[in-house]
């Protein structure tokens, strides 16, 4: 029976050009975690395997860094990185647990402030 729960960073925002850490945590289960997948829609970004460690998909190698922990760091963010990200915990005997994070990438704060505030 699947008793575990996944806590995530939920809805987050970050500045264009910056970086962000995606974090998930599986709790309330004694199941063994054999692998954690990080996915964006149906694209595999990275894998953290209990035996092999980290594998970053070749197309994301330049902008994705493993960790901290089972988390994932996205770098050099662009507006196109806005969207849903999923952490998928493969466990035994429970099976698959999925957490969802929504990331919004904003224009830089300088641009924002310039648009919103007038200097007296």
């Amino acid at each position: 029976m699947m008793t575990g729960t996944i806590e995530t960073t939920g809805n987050i925002s970050a500045e264009k050009g910056g970086s962000i850490i995606l974090q998930c945590h599986l709790s309330s289960t004694t199941a063994q975690v054999t692998q954690v997948n990080w996915e964006q829609q149906d694209q595999l970004l990275a894998i953290c395997n209990a035996d092999l460690g980290w594998h970053i998909s070749p197309s994301f190698k330049d902008r994705v860094a493993p960790g901290p922990g089972l988390g994932l760091t996205l770098q050099s963010l662009t507006v196109n990185d806005t969207g849903e990200y999923f952490c998928i915990y493969h466990t035994y005997p429970d099976g698959t647990y999925t957490g969802r994070i929504f990331l919004e990438v904003l224009e830089s704060s300088v641009a924002e402030h310039g648009a919103r505030f007038q200097i007296p």
Epitope: M2, Q32, T34, Q35, N37, D42, L44, I47, N49, A50, D51, L52, H55, H90, Y92, P93, D94, G95, T96, T98
Partner: antibody
């Protein structure tokens, strides 16, 4: 070309033992988790056991726990299934299969090796 | 264990037709269902996983849909090589379990 080839099946008496082998080629064996799946004479498929890429995690269906042991030799690119205390209900075609890198399914299967448990 | 009920168990169709095969899980398996093709003398072939993801090298005439408990495999424009046995399998929780299979034969 990815290939997995099973061997070691045969006729065995109830209570007997058998060791199946699966020789893998065409891919980096040590990177992939592997599974054994069996197909009964009635054509029903049943997942039997799984082993992680490095061999540190092994998982079994309740029907074989305590009787079957899955293992692997990454240096020899070979997967094993040691079957003890065999029962008539273990009669089946046994398939070795590779688990996808993302852990979602079984992407390459062998032709199978037949195991018959009968007195 | 999650029980998988596959229907129909037998299906007769003509080349060029579009067919659907259904699988129902005894409880929610999220999107985690795979479809395989079995042919005599050939090794089993993974077609679809995670409900709708097409396995690399599989033609787009095969498509999967569904979520929760109800899933469908659609094969469009049937060709002679598509007449085979098809199985679904849940990969949401252990033990992974399979449907009973659907035999697709030429009408």
């Amino acid at each position: 070309e990815v290939q997995v080839v099973e061997s070691g099946g045969g006729l065995v008496k109830p209570g007997g033992t058998l060791k199946l082998s699966c020789a893998a080629s065409g891919f980096t064996f040590s990177t992939y988790a592997m599974s054994w799946v069996r197909q009964s004479p009635e054509q029903r498929l049943e997942w039997v056991a799984e082993i992680s890429s490095g061999g540190s995690h092994t998982f079994y269906s309740d029907t074989v726990t305590g009787r079957f042991t899955i293992s692997r030799d990454n240096a020899q690119n070979t997967l094993y299934l040691e079957m003890n205390s065999l029962r008539s209900e273990d009669t089946a075609m046994y398939y070795c299969a590779r688990k996808t890198l993302d852990y979602y399914a079984l992407d390459y299967w062998g032709q199978g090796t037949s195991v018959t448990v009968s007195s | 264990d999650v029980q998988i009920t596959q229907s129909p168990s037998y299906l007769a169709a003509s080349p060029g037709e579009t067919i659907t095969i259904n699988c129902r899980a005894s409880k929610s398996i999220s999107k985690y269902l795979a479809w395989y093709q079995e042919k005599p003398g050939k090794t089993n072939k993974l077609l679809i996983y995670s409900g709708s993801r097409l396995q690399s090298g599989i033609p787009s005439k095969f498509s999967g849909s569904g979520y929760g408990t109800d899933f469908t495999l659609t094969i469009s424009s049937l060709e002679p090589e598509d007449f085979a046995m098809y199985y679904c399998q849940q990969h949401n929780e252990y033990p992974w379990t399979f449907g009973g299979g659907t035999k697709v034969e030429i009408k």
